[in-house]
């Protein structure tokens, strides 16, 4: 004869553990239903009785099979930095990201507990190494023959263009101005690409630099303070 | 956008019910709680209870125990609140909010009220 | 119950100054659970402060919220004619939720 199946809650054989869904309650000494994600447990099982499971409050959520008497507390509300990639459901906790422009730099097990926004590579210096989801822009100075006139956290140094007759020579922090009306464009040595674009200037007018200050890029870390990397910019 | 629409001022004897509706459009109705606070005449705000549209779960002050019934119609994207064994303490004005499940319950929406007077 | 008490109950400020209205619970409250609302007469409230410290868009930068525990506060930097209103905070840490009696901000 086939095995009977037991309704919870039942005693488990000696030596057997309970089913896939279930959990062994010590104080009734049987084995029980585990509430589904988005419940938890509002009264425990007894020899007779099998859990009674209730909705997570407000703002409270289980993610999976459970007995806990209460839910868990979302996480608080996305800062204004911050993007919410996933909404506080009764299954599944917020997850908080960090808006274009920011990098996290305190993660926590799901999002972003910190944000902080990218270092800007000021004018004589370009992007090193862009920033990550995690990780923030690290910038170098621009090698002879490239020069770079912005503050930008996505902006490499570019090659000087190359002149008949210069008007003014190029340095790390703007281009060469030629006298003549057809310049070439030359790649330099040492000049940096990386794997993003870059913006079409016009060759035959000379650029405005832009203002050398940047937004305040400070930001608090439980950790002391660090001086900023060269090339950066900051309070 | 998000708009909370209430029925309009009702005049009521002693003992009688009255039911108020609030309807809701700019928004899914789903993982969000329509509340029902009141306010009589000079005086603050009272949370009278609150209603999960999508599944009908309600809750609410005991103070209200016996006396309010909230009820939705997902058809119509329509919440009402109840409230019999009416008294002159009663007149107030009733108003819905909604709150978004996870916003630890802040009612970023108000309907316009609706004034209850309860007189014999 | 949590009983949620506001004070002043009413205070009268000139634009320009710097107003603070408390809020102190009878239990302690999760600073995710202390709400402040703006209500003009013959209007509903509005949400004004969410989750202690928090602003909706809409609301000026010179209004903040702070505290934690028992003890929360709304902070007017600089009064503006648009800001005299009533104030109630509102805690939704434990049911039945409760809202404070209400801070009347009158013209001076």
């Known amino acids: 004869l086939p095995a009977q199946v037991a309704f919870t809650p039942y005693a488990p054989e000696p030596g057997s553990t309970c089913r896939l869904r279930e959990y062994y309650d010590q104080t009734a000494q049987m084995c029980c239903s585990k509430c589904s994600p988005g419940q938890h447990a509002k009264v425990f099982c007894t020899k007779t009785s099998d859990t009674v499971c209730d909705s997570c409050e407000d703002s409270t959520y289980t993610q999976l099979w459970n007995w806990v008497p209460e839910c868990l507390s979302c996480g608080s509300r996305c800062s204004s930095d911050q993007v919410e990639t996933q909404a506080c459901t009764r299954e599944q906790n917020r997850i908080c990201t960090c808006r274009p422009g920011w990098y996290c730099a305190l993660s926590k097990q799901e999002g972003c507990r910190l944000c902080a926004p990218l270092r800007k590579c000021r004018p004589g210096f370009g992007v090193a190494r862009p920033g990550t989801e995690t990780s923030d822009v690290v910038c170098k100075p621009c090698a002879p023959g490239t020069f770079s006139n912005t503050t930008s956290s996505t902006d490499i140094c570019r090659p000087h263009q190359i002149c008949n007759v210069v008007a003014i020579p190029g340095n790390a922090s703007m281009d060469a101005v030629c006298t003549s009306t057809s310049p070439t464009r030359s790649m330099a040595p040492g000049a940096v690409h990386l794997p993003q674009p870059v913006s079409t200037r016009s060759q035959h007018t000379q650029p405005t630099p832009e203002p050398s200050t940047a937004p305040s890029t400070s930001f608090l870390l439980p950790m002391g303070p660090s001086p900023p990397a060269e090339g950066s910019t900051g309070d | 956008q998000v708009q909370l629409v209430q029925s309009g001022a009702e005049v009521k004897k002693p003992g009688a019910s009255v039911k108020v509706s609030c309807k809701a459009s700019?928004?899914?109705?789903?993982?969000?709680?329509m509340h029902w606070v009141r306010q009589a005449p000079g005086q603050g705000l009272e949370w009278i209870g609150r209603?999960?549209?999508?599944?009908?779960?309600?809750k609410h002050d005991p103070k209200f125990q016996d006396r309010v019934t909230m009820t939705s119609d997902t058809s119509t994207n329509t919440v009402y609140m109840e409230l019999s064994s009416l008294r002159s303490e009663d007149t107030a004005v009733y108003y819905c909010?909604?709150?978004?499940?996870?916003?630890?319950?802040?009612?970023?929406?108000w309907g316009q009220g609706t004034l209850v007077t309860v007189s014999s | 119950d949590i009983q949620m008490t506001q004070s002043p109950s009413s205070l009268s400020a000139s634009v320009g100054d710097r107003v603070t209205i408390t809020c102190t619970a009878s239990?302690?409250?999760?600073?995710?659970?202390l709400h402040w609302y703006q209500q003009k007469p013959g209007k509903a409230p509005k949400l004004w402060i969410y989750?202690?410290?928090n602003l909706p868009s809409g609301v000026p930068s010179r209004f903040s919220g702070s505290g934690s525990g028992t003890d929360f506060t709304l902070t007017i930097s600089s009064l503006q004619p648009e800001d005299f209103a009533t104030y109630y905070c509102?805690?939704?840490?434990?049911?039945?939720?409760?809202f404070g009696q209400g801070t009347k901000v009158e013209i001076k």
């Open positions: 909010a909604r709150s978004p499940y996870g916003d630890f319950g802040a009612m970023d929406y």
């Open positions: 700019g928004f899914n109705n789903k993982d969000i709680y």
């Open positions: 209603i999960d549209p999508a599944t009908g779960n309600t």
């Open positions: 239990s302690s409250v999760s600073s995710n659970y």
């Open positions: 989750s202690t410290s």
């Open positions: 509102h805690q939704y840490h434990r049911s039945p939720w409760t």
